[in-house]
Interface confidence: low
């Protein structure tokens, strides 16, 4: 039968399975998070988004998954990332007291997924989807990440760091989401501080990057939100990891 | 510093029901599991479950579902567990205790311990 | 449920000896490389103590005489050289099913 045709990839082939896999899996690695009916959180998740027209999902769709997978980050423990994930992550698995989204349940569930139904059939569509410069923003994973970007944001507390990408032309990015939804959901009255981690590209690059004038525009759009500012250059990404891994080795005294 | 204060000793009729109360202070209480933990003379630790007031969300052991209710009240920071249909073996100290949080699911703060006796 | 076997139900010693807990699991409590094994002591009218988390971690303030051990379905805590406050009740946990589960406990007493 006719389908649309989306400018984007198909749902992620066995996305149901994969779903339910991961929850499992999620809940036998962290027990904390037992409670969690991963049916139910399964049917929320295929109620947010399927017999929906792709075009039109809100985030109060997604607010039954949301309330289902509701966890927290103790103070000080948040790591946002932009344009960086794969170290962010890194990072994360090594020092196990902090957590990006990803580290989290609903963030764990659809990291590096893609998914849509159709309106009016209960199908998910593996053909395509939409994507977000050429067919809408508002379809199903964009507002999937939107959704519990602003909440993890809303969430974090006391000091709440950064990864953002020193190899790029705009190290911070305002149309990013750390730039367009979790910067502006940190809540002042209980985040102190913001610090970014600008890492660096080149061996060789020993530039002052938080002096880059996207940086500076960061510091601006935060220090208006009464979140004081700090920024640090990881001039040796590896070195950095391998710090973080052993801090007494003798050359984790000198500068990362 | 992380603090669980329970409500004191209890002394209960055989079939009737009791509410044990473990208020905590020092740390966000909805980020955290709240599990109980029975210990009944001479016969060691036995688990009966755990409440994440964050959402509500509730884990029991079978042996305890149906007798045992966890409910938690974020306004007050505090947890409860209530036994319905009390019987002589439910006559032991109940503990409140709190993991480490994600990653570190084991216990590593308790409250004092309230000795519920049972009588006939 | 997963049943945990503590051997010895008595141990005698005296201060300064190795005393050598094991705790037997009936199925694996291993899950993505950790042992989700937990030592607790326990005096009389207090609630328990952590001692050792996931097998071998000691937990935070406990002096490096206690240590753990093990994988799989064999765990032992092991305390050496002993103190005059070691001797307590221990019991080991696991975690990796429900329902979270402890073992009968060894009383470490005095010799």
């Known amino acids: 039968r006719w389908r649309q045709q989306w400018s984007g990839s198909g749902t992620t082939s066995r996305f149901p399975e994969t779903v339910l896999a991961r929850c499992v899996k999620y809940t036998e690695v962290h027990p904390e998070m037992r409670h969690v009916d991963c049916q139910s959180v399964w049917d929320a998740f295929k109620g947010a988004f399927i017999s929906k027209y792709p075009c039109n999902i809100t985030e109060e769709d997604y607010q039954p998954l949301v309330k289902l997978g509701t966890q927290t980050v103790p103070c000080n423990k948040t790591l946002l990332w932009s344009r960086i994930k794969d170290l962010a992550h890194q990072f994360t698995q090594v020092q196990r007291d902090m957590f990006t989204l990803e580290d989290m349940l609903l963030g764990y569930l659809a990291d590096d997924l893609t998914w849509c139904g159709e309106f009016n059939t209960f199908e998910i569509n593996y053909q395509s989807c939409p994507d977000w410069r050429k067919d809408c923003s508002n379809n199903p994973v964009s507002v999937f990440w939107k959704t519990v970007s602003r909440r993890f944001a809303e969430t974090a507390c006391g000091v709440v760091h950064v990864m953002l990408n020193g190899s790029r032309s705009k190290i911070f990015d305002k149309n990013s989401t750390f730039g367009s939804v979790e910067v502006h959901n940190l809540q002042p009255e209980k985040v102190q501080a913001l610090e970014a981690w600008v890492i660096h590209g080149g061996r060789e690059d020993s530039r002052d990057l938080c002096q880059d004038p996207t940086i500076k525009e960061l510091e601006s759009i935060i220090s208006k939100r009464n979140i004081r500012f700090f920024c640090k250059n990881i001039y040796r990404p590896d070195k950095f990891l391998q710090c973080v891994k052993n801090p007494e080795d003798s050359s984790c005294l000198s500068g990362i | 510093q992380v603090q669980l204060v329970q409500s004191g000793a209890e002394v209960v009729k055989s079939g009737a029901s009791v509410k044990v109360s473990c208020k905590a202070s020092?740390?966000?209480?909805?980020?955290?599991?709240m599990h109980w933990v029975k210990e009944a003379p001479g016969q060691g630790l036995e688990w009966i479950g755990y409440?994440?007031?964050?959402?509500?969300?509730?884990n029991y052991n079978q042996k305890f579902q149906g007798r045992a209710t966890l409910t938690a009240d974020t306004s007050a920071s505090t947890a409860y567990m209530e036994i319905s249909s009390l019987r002589s073996e439910d006559t032991a100290v109940y503990f409140c205790?709190?993991?480490?949080?994600?990653?570190?699911?084991?216990?590593?703060?308790w409250g004092q311990g309230t000795l519920v006796t049972v009588s006939s | 449920d997963i049943v945990l076997t503590q051997s010895p139900a008595t141990l005698s010693l005296s201060p300064g000896e190795r005393a050598t807990i094991s705790c037997r699991a009936s199925?694996?409590?291993?899950?993505?490389?950790?042992?989700?094994m937990h030592w607790y002591q326990q005096k009389p009218g207090q609630p328990p103590r952590l001692l050792i988390y996931?097998?071998?971690s000691r937990a935070t303030g406990i002096p490096a005489r206690f240590s753990g051990s093990g994988s799989g379905t064999d765990f032992t805590l092991t305390i050496s050289p002993l103190e005059p406050e070691d001797f307590a009740v221990y019991y080991c946990?696991?975690?990796?099913?429900?329902?979270?589960?402890f073992g009968g406990g060894t009383k470490l007493e005095i010799k």
């Open positions: 205790a709190r993991t480490g949080g994600l990653r570190r699911a084991y216990f590593t703060y």
């Open positions: 946990q696991q975690n990796k099913e429900d329902p979270w589960t």
């Open positions: 020092g740390y966000t209480f909805t980020s955290f599991n």
């Open positions: 409440i994440y007031p964050g959402n509500g969300g509730t």
């Open positions: 199925e694996s409590v291993d899950s993505y490389g950790n042992g989700f």
């Open positions: 996931l097998a071998s």
